[in-house]
Interface confidence: low
């Protein structure tokens, strides 16, 4: 008599999470009499997946009617597959007895579950940095299977190369996670720039998934300061302007000092945006020359985004000015830079 064969034709089956998996098994002979059972894994710790005779297996159904006479097809269908169902499934023939005796096992079918990666989440640095500094962005995506995946970083359409990527865990798992860090060198023009993390995987049958971060959250563009004087007015008042240009973010406090004493403090708000995303702001101070005997040292002090103050000073020469009305002599700009931190 020819030896019984248990045939599992597929070495492996790959199924998308949520779909059904069909595991095929046929036997070459109806004898000896005895049941077929399905297990996941081999050895003493194997897990019973399906037993026609007894037990409750709500997600497992036989493909053909196993009670039919002369049935030699013991294929099963497992519904609503999840990554936890991955593993090698064995179709095992038993000889009828008390108890039934294991006679022959199929070669096994490895079920791999294709699970989509989650949408990539990109996070940037906790604190802002200025141009020419390097900042790191992190991208994470979870829950995918199989392990093979690729991740690319872009800044304004250009692929970044200073990237470090890890897929965890290193060994076999029902699903995997990817974490990647990209280092980006900032420029003053990056307020409108964007970094994109792009993840592609077998389960993504079209475009890869993308996560984005705006460099506006990571960059600080320090201001340029310039203090200038308009010509003296007829009422002996000098109009001095402090121009604060090309800064980002908008959070900025400006203080005027007259001979070291605080004259006025202003906060920037609702400023129009430059094309490159930065802001400009101009503040004026009227100085009554006739109220001063000596030269007046004016200082425009700017605190930007919580950084140390930047000062620009300017001396108005009052000793040379006659006190009568109509004097129109220009003041002298000493342009002293008390502290200029960029």
């Amino acid at each position: 008599e020819e030896e019984l064969q248990v045939i599992q034709p597929e070495k492996s089956v790959s199924v998308a999470a949520g779909d059904s998996a069909t595991l095929n098994c046929t036997v070459s002979s109806l004898i000896p009499v005895g049941p077929i059972q399905w297990f996941r894994g081999a050895g003493p710790g194997r897990e019973l997946i399906y037993n026609l005779k007894e037990g409750h297996f709500p997600r497992v159904t036989p493909v053909s009617d196993p009670t039919k006479r002369n049935n030699m097809d013991f294929s099963i269908r497992i519904s609503n597959i999840t990554p936890a169902d991955a593993g090698t499934y064995y179709c095992v023939k038993f000889r009828k007895g008390s108890p039934d005796v294991e006679l022959k096992s199929g070669a096994g079918t490895e079920l791999s579950v294709r699970a989509k990666p989650s949408a990539p989440v990109v996070s940037g640095p906790a604190v802002r940095a200025t141009a020419e500094h390097t900042v790191s962005f992190t991208c994470e995506s979870h829950g995918f299977s199989p392990r093979d995946i690729t991740l690319k970083w872009f800044k304004n359409g250009n692929e970044l190369s200073d990237v470090q990527t890890n897929v965890d865990p290193a060994g076999k798992s029902v699903s995997y996670s990817i974490r990647s860090t990209a280092r980006v060198v900032l420029t003053r023009r990056d307020v409108h720039s964007q970094v994109i993390c792009e993840v592609a995987h077998v389960t993504l049958q079209g475009d890869p998934l993308r996560g984005t971060a705006n460099l506006s959250e990571a960059i600080r563009v320090p201001p340029f300061l310039e203090v200038t004087q308009q010509s003296m007015r007829a009422d002996n008042q000098v109009n001095v302007t402090c121009q604060v240009t090309k800064f980002y973010p908008q959070r900025l406090q400006l203080t005027w000092l007259e001979n070291g004493n605080v004259s006025r403090t202003e906060m920037a708000s609702a400023l129009p945006e430059n094309k490159d995303g930065t802001y400009n702001w101009t503040s004026w101070l009227l100085v009554n020359v006739s109220a001063h005997r000596d030269d007046v040292k004016l200082t425009c002090q700017v605190e930007h985004d919580g950084q140390p103050a930047v000062n620009k000073s300017f001396s108005v020469k009052v000793s040379a000015h006659p006190k009568e009305q109509g004097s129109n002599t220009a003041a002298e700009n000493t342009g002293t830079n008390e502290r200029n931190i960029y």
Epitope: D148, A200, Q205, D207, P208
Partner: antibody
């Protein structure tokens, strides 16, 4: 580095068949789909279809069903294009081209191209 | 099938010129559009995918824009090595289709 190396030029008689190979180097063949593109002399590019290198399943464009067969031999990291019952109008350069997306098997944009194989059909 | 129409079919320009090639799809292809460069007797070279993304190693003078049905490839300052034929390709819908090509020649 990544490269697709195709077999050399072929001169065939009408009615014969030809098999063009495309060997993948620098990456795993089964990780990226492989497309085939035809360029007749002096003409533009024409997409013939692609093979899902993960499952081996081919997809053919409308004009390339029947005489054209895409296949794989993963043991030698090679994709093949076989054309049967050759006609004079099959004279063209045939390119293999890798789909850009990792495991992106729906055709897509191509990131790497083979150098091309000229197939000439003449009696 | 989606028809891809490039204009102009040919173009003469000088080194240093700014050149724009347009590609129009007969129906919406989203951003599933790629650009390729081909020199005589050579295989095509991949320049741009997803309408705007340059492949690594592609000079920054090449840029892509557009979505839906209208796309452009711009070369900001032509270099001697840029004289070639350029093809657009949509990969939104089967069959994947190419434009007829734009031949960029030296003036």
């Amino acid at each position: 580095q990544i490269q697709l190396v195709q077999s050399g030029s072929e001169l065939k008689k009408p009615g014969a068949s030809v098999k063009v190979s495309c060997r993948a180097g620098g990456y795993t063949l089964t990780d990226y789909a492989m497309n085939w593109v035809r360029q007749a002399p002096g003409q533009g590019l024409e997409w013939m279809g692609f093979i899902n290198t993960y499952t081996g399943e081919p997809t053919y464009a409308q004009g390339f069903k029947g005489r054209f067969v895409f296949s794989l031999d993963t043991s030698v990291s090679t994709a093949y294009l076989q054309i049967g019952s050759l006609k004079a109008e099959d004279t063209a350069v045939y390119y293999c081209a890798r789909t850009r997306g990792y495991y992106d098997f729906d055709g897509g944009a191509f990131d790497y191209w083979g150098q091309g194989t000229l197939v000439t059909v003449s009696s | 099938d989606i028809q891809m129409t490039q204009s102009p079919s040919s173009l003469s320009a000088s080194v240093g010129d700014r050149v724009t090639i347009t590609c129009r799809a007969s129906q919406n292809v989203g951003t599933h559009l790629a650009w390729y460069q081909q020199k005589p007797g050579k295989a095509p070279k991949s320049l741009i995918y997803s309408a705007i993304y340059r492949y690594i190693g592609v000079p920054s003078r090449f840029s892509g824009s557009g979505s839906g049905t209208d796309f452009t490839l711009t070369i900001s300052s032509l270099q001697p090595e840029d004289f070639a034929t350029y093809y657009c390709q949509q990969y939104n819908t089967y069959p994947l289709t190419f434009g007829q090509g734009t031949k960029l020649e030296i003036k």
